[in-house]
């Protein structure tokens, strides 16, 4: 039952997460121009991944795509590229999890596929968390920068008689949706993963032996990491030999931990 | 078509306020912002405040002490209100619309001649 | 607040004749974000409220003779009229519509000859 919730649970978180990641990634308010020096403009800029804009005090807004390639500065390609590369792997993961789910039923797939799926999910949310997570980073390191070196010659003019503000820019409100948004599709990751762990069967995929030595009941299972599956085929009830060897299959009728939570 | 009419007391006594009202026809209050210029006899264009589409206000520092812009969306009427007004506030007062994009006054009204005097 | 500078305060022109008028502003009145300058100019004929000519510093409002032409950007601007004709006898103002309070200049006055 706990298994099922952690999954359902990171499920759900993941979705979010990436939903969120998508929504940061569409915003046009990834940099806000910064009103600490100017609260009195008319005029209020702000910058997506995608396109500027330029909001009016009437209410008229005018956006503009960055229709050239080429032309972008490396890092925001970089951002965009990180970003992008979250969504899909995001997506992709969502896809997977889906089938993963200990609740839906798909024909007669056994909890070892099952698991396999978790985790690659899991793994999947993870890297796309950490990928949203990294691009917005990039993206407010290259804001401070730019801030920083724009306050620096804040104010250029002929002998002083002329202001010409510069407008700097201050993190906008993709860049916290992004940072919130990256760090559930990382904890739905995670939860997926540790639901991995109890989906799994008591032991391994491959072809567990124990070895009865004489006089003794006490039995060695090599234990490895439950989650190892493959998505290969799984011989059933194939003896290696009679003497005390048991298949992995047999085994499995002993109770597991996990039935009982 | 687009008309902005000013209506005032005309004459004022000095320290008592002035309340003036726009009326508009041809644009609605809650697609335009309205603005309001002075112009002192034989001297130049002051610009006093406005009232934006959706509501909210922005005044000269100078003046915003004393001065207060609101309007009534349905009525489709703009209110200016100034207080413990003075001599050198004896002014023609207009109201104008905005135009929308790029921010400037593309319709005026014919003016309400204010006189501060006891 | 921003100060803007208007120049010659008053000239007298011939009509026909090519008329230029400056305007200087305190702080420069071009926004990166669209890269357009936020000044207007505007006519004022004696005994009439002031009708807006030009618009984004270089924009012509609608029912503006083509002969009314605006230039410049940041801080420094300009109005042409191209041919003076008689009816252009008025005060002309150019005004900051970018940071509040939108001053004005203190005009320039048009005469004909």
């Known amino acids: 039952m706990a298994v099922t919730a952690c999954q359902g649970l990171g499920f759900v978180v993941s979705l979010i997460g990436i939903a969120g990641i998508i929504a940061a990634t569409c915003m046009d308010q990834w940099s806000t121009q910064d009103l600490y020096n100017n609260p009195v403009t008319a005029v209020f800029n702000y910058q997506g991944l995608w396109r500027s804009c330029v909001r009016e005090s009437s209410g008229f807004t005018e956006c503009r795509g960055y229709f050239t390639l080429l032309g972008l500065p490396a890092m925001l390609q970089a951002v965009r590229a990180l970003m992008i590369v979250g969504i899909v792997l995001g997506a992709i993961g969502l896809l997977v999890s889906i089938f993963a789910l200990k609740c839906i039923r798909i024909g007669s797939m056994e909890d070892s596929a099952k698991a396999n799926m978790t985790l690659t999910s899991g793994i999947m949310f993870i890297v796309s968390g950490l990928c949203a997570i990294a691009g917005v980073s990039v993206f407010a390191n290259m804001l401070v920068t730019n801030f920083w070196m724009s306050t620096a010659n804040m104010y250029t003019g002929m002998g002083g008689m002329v202001q010409t503000v510069q407008t700097r820019y201050t993190f906008g409100a993709a860049l916290f949706v992004g940072w919130v948004a990256g760090g559930l599709t990382l904890i739905g990751g995670v939860m997926m993963c540790i639901a991995c762990r109890g989906l799994a069967p008591e032991e391994t995929n491959y072809k567990a032996v124990s070895y009865h030595a004489s006089g003794h009941s006490v039995a060695y299972k090599p234990g490895g990491f439950k989650a190892s599956t493959g998505f290969g085929s799984n011989t059933k009830n194939k003896k290696i030999y009679d003497g005390g060897a048991r298949t992995e299959d047999e085994v499995q009728s002993y109770p597991s931990k996990h039935d009982y939570v | 078509q687009v008309q902005l009419k000013e209506s005032g007391p005309g004459l004022v006594a000095p320290s008592q306020s002035l309340s003036i009202t726009c009326t508009v026809s041809?644009?609605?209050?809650?697609?335009?912002?309205v603005y309001w210029v002075r112009q002192s006899p034989g001297k130049g264009l002051e610009w006093l405040g406005v009232?934006?589409?959706?509501?909210?206000?922005n005044y000269n520092s100078a003046l915003m002490s004393r001065l207060s812009i609101s309007k009534d969306n349905s009525k489709s009427q703009v209110f200016l209100k100034m207080n413990s007004l003075q001599t050198d506030d004896t002014a023609m007062y207009y109201c104008?619309?905005?135009?929308?994009?790029?921010?400037?006054?593309?319709?005026w009204g014919q003016g309400t001649s204010v006189t501060v005097s006891s | 607040d921003v100060v803007m500078t208007q120049s010659p305060s008053s000239l007298s022109v011939s009509a026909g004749e090519k008329v230029t008028m400056s305007c200087k502003s305190s702080?420069?009145?071009?926004?990166?974000?669209?890269?357009?300058?936020?000044l207007a100019w505007y006519q004022q004929k004696p005994g009439q409220p002031p009708k807006l000519l030009i618009y984004?510093?270089?924009t012509r409002e609608s029912g503006v003779p083509d002969r009314f032409t605006g230039s410049g950007s940041g801080t420094d601007f300009t109005l042409t009229i191209s041919s003076v004709q008689a009816e252009d006898l008025a005060v002309y103002y150019c005004?900051?519509?970018?940071?509040?309070?939108?001053?004005f200049g203190s005009g320039t006055k048009l005469e004909i000859k």
């Open positions: 104008a619309r905005d135009r929308g994009r790029l921010l400037a006054m593309d319709y």
């Open positions: 041809g644009f609605s209050l809650t697609s335009y912002g």
């Open positions: 009232v934006w589409a959706g509501g909210n206000t």
């Open positions: 702080q420069s009145l071009l926004n990166s974000g669209n890269q357009k300058n936020y």
């Open positions: 984004g510093a270089s």
């Open positions: 005004q900051n519509d970018h940071f509040f309070p939108f001053t």
